[in-house]
C-alpha cells in the first residue's frame, strides 16, 4: 500500500502565447485538477477505468478571465493531489492530468465545468524515489508538475510489496519509522536542512534540501526563471533550477508522453504515440478524437487541436463535456400533479388517478365525450370536470333528482314547496321575501325592499333557482 502524490506548480499559456480557448467564460472562474492513474504503458482506451485510482483537487482561488490579456499563470488550488493505492505499485503506469475550469456564473443547474487541458504521461516510476518533475503541453497550455510514489509503512520497496517489521519485540518509538533500507531496525526519518521550504522542498538524506521542479535556491524558496531552459530535456539541476541536456542527444529521453527517442547526426528524433506530436511529443490538444464528451454526448467540430470542439449533450446532461447530470424532474414536466421519474434513458410520469399520457396531460374526466344529463352543462377546470346542473337535478352527471327544499331555504319558519321553476317559500305571518327573510312592520310596510306590487305578506314567494352546482 502507498500513496501517489502530485504537485501542480503552474498552469498557463505555453511559450507560444495565449491559448485559443474553445470556451468563453461569462463570469468568475476557478481551476481544479483531476488525476487518473492507469496501470501499464500500453495505450489504454480513454474511457478505461482509473484502475490504480483517481483524485480530484480542491477548487483554486476565484479569478476573472480577461480575454484580451490572459493571466500568465492561472491561480492554483492549494496542496498535493494524493491517490492512495492498496496493492503493489506497478512501476509502469499512465498518468492522466485534467485541468478543469468551473464557471461560477448563474447557469441553470449550478456551475458549468469545462475541460481546458488533458495531458497523459506514460512512465516508469519506482516507489520511494525522489520527486520527478515534468512540463507538459496541451494545445497552447503548459502544465508544470512533480510527482512521486511513496509506500505507507510497514510496506517498503520499489513496489511497496515488502513488509518490514522492527527486529525488537517492542514497536518503534515516537518519531521513528520501522526499517532502515537494509536492516530490520527502527530509524528516524531524515531531518531536512533547517529552513527548507515545506511546500517546495524535500529531502531523502538528513541535512539536504532538494527542490521540487520549478523551484531553486538553497532552501527552495526561489521560483525558477522560465526564460532560457524549459525547452530542454534532461536531468534536473538543483543548482540552476534548469533542465540541462545530458551528454548524448537521447540521454534522459527528451521525448515526453511515452515517445521513443532515436539519435540522428547531432540531434535526436521522437516517435510519438497517438494523440501527441511536436518535436518532443509534448503537444496534446483535446480534440474529438480524444473522446471529450461524456454520457453519450456527441463531439462536434474540433478536428484539430486549434479548433474548438463542442459537445452536444443528451437531454439528461449538461456542461461543456456533458459531465453534469441534469435533474430533469426539477423542470416539473409531469402535469396535473404527476410523479416524475428520471430513468436515465427516459423520463416517465406516474399519473394521478383520472389522468393519462406521457406527461399526464390528458384528463380522463374532461368534457370531451362526456355529457351532463337533464340539460346540465360541462365545465372543465382544476384538473377535473364538473356538471353545472339544470334546476331540480344534481349529482356527478346531473342524473340525480335534486330536492331544492332539502337545505331548508325558507327562513323564520316558512314552508318550502318544490316548483317546476324553482322552490317556493310560504312565509309565516310577519315575514316576507323570496326566502321569508324580511320581517313585516306592524303598519304593513317592510323594513327592507318593498314587496312586489300585488303581493301581500304571507303569500308564497317564488324564488327561481337557476342552477345547482355539484362539484366532484
Amino acid at each position: 500500500a502507498g500513496v501517489f502524490e502530485l504537485q501542480i506548480h503552474s498552469f498557463g499559456p505555453g511559450p507560444g502565447g495565449a491559448p485559443r480557448s474553445p470556451y468563453s467564460a461569462r463570469g468568475p472562474c476557478r481551476l481544479f485538477f483531476r488525476v487518473c492513474l492507469k496501470p501499464g504503458l500500453s495505450e489504454e482506451a480513454a474511457e478505461s477505468p482509473c484502475a490504480l485510482g483517481a483524485a480530484l483537487s480542491a477548487r483554486g482561488p476565484v479569478y476573472t478571465e480577461q480575454p484580451e490579456a490572459p493571466a500568465p499563470d492561472l491561480p492554483l488550488p492549494n496542496g498535493l493531489l494524493q491517490v492512495p493505492f492498496r496493492d503493489a505499485w506497478p512501476g509502469t503506469f499512465s498518468l492522466i492530468i485534467e485541468t478543469w475550469r468551473e464557471e461560477l456564473g448563474d447557469q441553470i443547474g449550478g456551475p458549468a465545468w469545462s475541460l481546458l487541458a488533458r495531458v497523459t504521461r506514460r512512465r516508469r516510476l519506482a516507489a520511494g524515489g525522489p520527486w520527478a518533475g515534468d512540463i507538459q503541453r496541451a494545445g497552447a497550455w503548459e502544465l508544470r508538475f512533480s510527482y512521486r510514489a511513496r509506500c505507507e509503512l510497514p510496506a517498503v520497496g520499489t513496489a511497496c510489496t515488502r513488509l518490514c517489521r522492527p527486529r525488537s519485540a517492542s514497536r518503534c518509538g515516537p518519531g521513528l519509522r520501522p526499517c532502515a533500507p537494509l536492516e530490520d531496525e527502527c530509524e528516524a526519518p531524515p531531518v531536512c536542512r533547517a529552513g527548507c521550504s515545506l511546500e517546495h522542498g524535500f529531502c531523502e538524506q538528513p541535512g539536504e534540501c532538494r527542490c521540487l521542479e520549478g523551484w531553486t535556491g538553497p532552501l527552495c524558496m526561489v521560483p525558477v526563471s522560465t526564460s532560457s531552459c524549459l525547452g530542454l530535456r534532461g536531468p534536473s539541476s538543483t543548482t540552476t533550477g534548469c533542465l540541462v541536456p545530458g551528454p548524448g542527444p537521447c540521454d534522459g529521453n527528451p521525448c515526453a508522453n511515452g515517445g521513443s527517442c532515436s539519435e540522428t547526426p547531432g540531434s535526436f528524433e521522437c516517435t510519438c504515440p497517438r494523440g501527441f506530436y511536436g518535436l518532443r511529443c509534448e503537444v496534446s490538444g483535446v480534440t474529438c478524437a480524444d473522446g471529450p464528451c461524456f454520457n453519450g454526448g456527441l463531439c462536434v467540430g474540433g478536428a484539430d487541436p486549434d479548433s474548438a470542439y463542442i459537445c452536444h449533450c443528451p437531454p439528461g446532461f449538461q456542461g461543456s463535456n456533458c459531465e453534469k447530470r441534469v435533474d430533469r424532474c426539477s423542470l416539473q414536466p409531469c402535469r396535473n400533479g404527476g410523479l416524475c421519474l428520471d430513468l436515465g434513458h427516459a423520463l416517465r410520469c406516474r399519473c394521478r388517478a383520472g389522468f393519462a399520457g406521457p406527461r399526464c396531460e390528458h384528463d380522463l374526466n374532461d368534457c370531451a365525450g362526456r355529457a351532463c344529463a337533464n340539460g346540465g352543462t360541462c365545465v372543465e377546470g382544476g384538473g377535473a370536470h364538473r356538471c353545472s346542473c339544470a334546476l331540480g337535478f344534481g349529482g356527478r352527471d346531473c342524473r340525480e333528482r335534486a330536492d331544492p327544499c332539502a337545505a331548508r331555504p325558507c327562513a323564520h319558519g316558512g314552508r318550502c314547496y318544490a316548483h317546476f321553476s324553482g322552490l317556493v317559500c310560504a312565509c309565516a305571518p310577519g315575514y316576507m321575501g323570496a326566502r321569508c327573510e324580511f320581517p313585516v312592520h306592524p303598519d304593513g310596510v317592510s323594513a327592507l325592499p318593498a314587496a312586489p306590487p300585488g303581493l301581500r305578506p304571507g303569500d308564497p314567494q317564488r324564488y327561481p333557482h337557476h342552477h345547482h352546482h355539484h362539484h366532484h
Epitope: A45, A46, E47, C288, A289, D290, G291, P292, C293, F294, N295, G296, G297, L298, C299, V300, G301, H312, P314, P315, G316, P333, G344, H345, A346, L347, G357, P358, R359
Partner: antibody, heavy 118, light 108 residues
C-alpha cells in the same frame, strides 16, 4: 407508444426544394433531439441532421449548404427543407427520435419515398 | 469523418446457426459510442444495441454486441427466422454521425 409520421410530396422536380414534415404523437417534442435520415433505393443509411427543442441543430457537412431543419413546438412537428435537389437526393426519408443515452435513433417513422424527377 | 466498414457484405446461414457481423472504424470510436440496427425490407431500421454492448428495450438476449476502439462485433447466437435482415452499425461519438454499409443476413 411514441409514433412518428413523415408527410410531404413524393415527387420533386430537379433544382426545386424538397420539404418534409414529421409529426410526433404521444410525446412532447421538447424532451428529445429529432433527426432526419435518408436511404437511397437499394443503398445504405445516411444521416442528414438533427434539431433540439432549444434550437440547437447539427447537419451533415455534405448537405449543410442546402439544408434547413426547423421545429414547431405548438404543432409537435419538425421539418426538413433541402434546396436545389438533384436525382441523387432520391431516397426514402425517415424521421427519427434521438435516443436519450447517446446519438443513436430509438424510434423511427415508417419513411416516405421522395423521387426527384422532371 | 469516421468511415465504418461492415463485413461480410452478405452472410448466408441457416436458422439455428450463429451469425457474427463485423464493423470496423477508420479511427477510434470514443467511449464505445456505437449502435447496431436491424432493417427488414420495406421497414424502418430498429435499434438493437447501443454503447457497443447494451441491448435496447425489448431486444432478445440472442443479440450481443462487443468491441471497442476500432473493431466491433454483433453476434446472433441462434438465428431465428425473423432475424434474416440487413444489419447496420452507426457511430455517434463524433459528428457527422455515420453508418456502415450494412451486412445482409440471408437464409442459406
Amino acid at each position: 407508444q411514441v409514433q412518428l409520421q413523415e408527410s410531404g410530396p413524393g415527387l420533386v422536380k430537379p433544382s426545386e426544394t424538397l420539404s418534409l414534415t414529421c409529426t410526433v404523437s404521444d410525446d412532447s417534442i421538447s424532451n428529445y433531439y429529432w433527426s432526419w435520415i435518408r436511404q437511397p433505393p437499394g443503398k445504405g443509411l445516411e444521416w442528414i441532421g438533427y434539431i433540439f427543442y432549444s434550437g440547437t441543430t447539427n447537419h451533415n457537412p455534405s448537405l449543410k449548404s442546402r439544408l434547413t431543419i426547423s421545429l414547431d413546438k405548438a404543432k409537435n412537428q419538425f421539418s426538413l427543407r433541402l434546396s436545389s435537389v438533384t436525382a441523387a437526393d432520391t431516397a426514402v426519408y425517415y424521421c427519427a427520435r434521438v435516443f436519450n443515452w447517446g446519438f443513436a435513433f430509438d424510434i423511427w417513422g415508417q419513411g416516405t419515398m421522395v423521387t426527384v424527377s422532371s | 469523418e469516421i468511415v465504418l466498414t461492415q463485413s461480410p457484405g452478405t452472410l448466408s446461414l441457416s436458422p439455428g446457426e450463429r451469425a457474427t457481423l463485423s464493423c470496423r472504424a477508420s479511427q477510434r470510436i470514443s467511449r464505445t459510442y456505437l449502435a447496431w440496427y436491424q432493417q427488414k425490407p420495406g421497414q424502418a431500421p430498429r435499434l438493437l444495441i447501443y454503447g457497443a454492448s447494451s441491448r435496447a428495450t425489448g431486444i432478445p438476449d440472442r443479440f450481443t454486441g462487443s468491441g471497442s476502439g476500432t473493431d466491433f462485433t454483433l453476434t446472433i447466437s441462434r438465428l431465428e427466422p425473423e432475424d434474416f435482415a440487413v444489419y447496420y452499425c452507426q457511430q455517434y461519438g463524433t459528428s457527422p454521425l455515420t453508418f456502415g454499409g450494412g451486412t445482409k443476413v440471408e437464409i442459406n
